[in-house]
């Protein structure tokens, strides 16, 4: 077990920021609580990439080129508080990606290319406080997707091309009841609702032709 040559390791924090890494380092000390991998050129998160490190509380993979995430990449990380994945090329979240992450409080997925969310994507995230999906490619979100998020306080959904039809009516209702969307999510279409804030549109206006 070792500290990767380009990185610094102290106090159970592995700091590999901006070191030109193309893959996740392996054989790290099992006691690590934080790994900082931002600003590298990592493209793939392989199966069980972080599973040996059961004490991890924070993973930062922001500003890489991640386009592929193994479904069990974060399996078993019951102490994980923060997962930072913004600024990558993620198009979808594999089934069960966040399974068992009961301690997660912060999930930053902004500035990716996510075009759809499974209704059970956030199933185990009962303690999530902040979810950022800002600046993705979401056109709709299925009713019930946010139901498991019992502790959610802040959500960022802006800069997504939302189609405000009958399928998104539930989201308007949800945001009226829970004014937690602080980034100003807006409709892209239909034209009559374009650029209007989802949380401020009367739910009867969300119609399907």
């Amino acid at each position: 077990l070792h500290c990767p040559a380009a990185c610094t390791c102290s106090n159970n924090i592995v700091d590999c920021r901006g070191k030109g890494l193309t893959e996740i380092p392996t054989n790290l000390p099992e006691t690590i609580t934080e790994i900082r991998l931002e600003q590298n050129t990592i493209k793939v998160i392989p199966p069980g990439a972080f599973s040996p490190y059961k004490k991890l509380r924070r993973i930062d993979l922001s500003n890489n080129q991640i386009s592929e995430l193994a479904p069990d990449a974060f399996q078993g990380l019951r102490s994980l508080n923060s997962l930072v994945l913004y600024g990558n090329k993620i198009t979808e979240l594999p089934k069960s990606l966040f399974e068992g992450l009961f301690s997660l409080q912060l999930l930053l997925l902004n500035a990716n290319k996510i075009n759809c969310l499974r209704v059970d994507a956030f199933q185990d995230l009962h303690n999530l406080n902040l979810l950022s999906l800002y600046d993705n490619k979401l056109q709709t979100i299925a009713k019930g997707t946010f139901s498991p998020l019992r502790a959610i306080q802040t959500m960022h959904l802006a800069q997504n091309p939302f189609i405000c039809d009958c399928h998104l009516k539930w989201l308007a209702d949800y945001l009226h009841t829970n004014p937690i969307e602080t980034s100003g999510a807006r409709c892209t279409s239909p034209r009559r609702l374009a650029n209007k804030r989802i949380g401020q549109i009367k739910s009867k206006k969300f119609r399907c032709s």
């Epitope: 931002e38 509380r57 923060s82 802040t154």
Partner: antibody, heavy 118, light 107 residues
Framework: QVQLVQSGAEVKQPGSSVKVSCKAS????????VSWVRQAPGQGLEWMGG????????NYAQKFQGRVTITADESTDTVYMDLSSLKSEDTAVYYC???????????WGQGTLVTVSS | DIQMTQSPSSLSASIGDRVTITCRAS??????LNWYQQKPGKAPKFLIY???NLQSGVPSRFSGSGSGTDFTLTISSLQPEDFAIYYC?????????FGGGTTVEIK
């Protein structure tokens, strides 16, 4: 690891405001949460609110809502806490703290004593 | 808000003693409990997270246990540098709240 360095002690008049700064050294905290916790003389610890610098939106304790403003300047890796309409009961040491989640405080600044007195 | 109650509020002990501090939450917080140590004129120091996990660099004589509403911080063999105030804190729901503190003094 990130070290937090706070601005110096302040003496303020009742009714005025105070702005305390917290600067990260030895690393950026742009995607960390930074919270403010205060401690009145001889008293316990009280969370006031927090922010994630990359987003700029803050989360406040209801008790301080409308009176406290937490902001971040990403370019200088500094977070600020502005408390207005000061009362003598606001005399306290104000700490910034950062951690792995919204409500876990791994690392603390050295504290800033704010004295409110006429 | 979730209320956190610590007991005792102060205790006197000798070097080498086993010391136990308890913390009770007003509602179930699962294992979302942290412990901090504070010495006079200093910032709090993070000791234990998630009820039982030692923060890096914290001596193994410190341990934490509990789940739900009742939690315990134990110092197995008190050392001179352990005389301080200890606070518990819940990180389960906003706002995070602290216990009133337990002062550990030299007997």
């Amino acid at each position: 690891q990130v070290q937090l360095v706070q601005s110096g002690a302040e003496v303020k008049q009742p009714g005025s405001s105070v702005k305390v700064s917290c600067k990260a050294s030895g690393g950026s905290f742009r995607s960390y949460t930074v919270s403010w916790v205060r401690q009145a003389p001889g008293q316990g610890l009280e969370w006031m609110g927090g922010i994630i610098p990359i987003f700029g939106t803050a989360n406040y304790a209801q008790k301080f809502q409308g009176r406290v403003t937490i902001t971040a300047d990403e370019s200088t890796d500094t977070v600020y806490m502005d408390l207005s309409s000061l009362k003598s009961e606001d005399t306290a040491v104000y700490y910034c703290a950062t951690g792995s989640g919204w409500y876990t405080f791994d690392y603390w600044g050295q504290g800033t004593l704010v004295t409110v007195s006429s | 808000d979730i209320q956190m109650t610590q007991s005792p509020s102060s205790l006197s002990a000798s070097i080498g003693d086993r010391v136990t501090i308890t913390c009770r939450a007003s509602q179930n917080i699962n294992a979302y409990l942290n412990w901090y140590q504070q010495k006079p004129g200093k910032a709090p120091k993070f000791l234990i997270y998630a009820a039982s996990n030692l923060q890096s660099g914290v001596p193994s004589r410190f341990s934490g246990s509990g789940s739900g509403t009742d939690f315990t911080l134990t110092i197995s063999s008190l050392q001179p540098e352990d005389f301080a105030i200890y606070y518990c804190q819940q990180s389960y729901r906003s706002p995070p709240t602290f216990g009133g503190g337990t002062t550990v003094e030299i007997k």
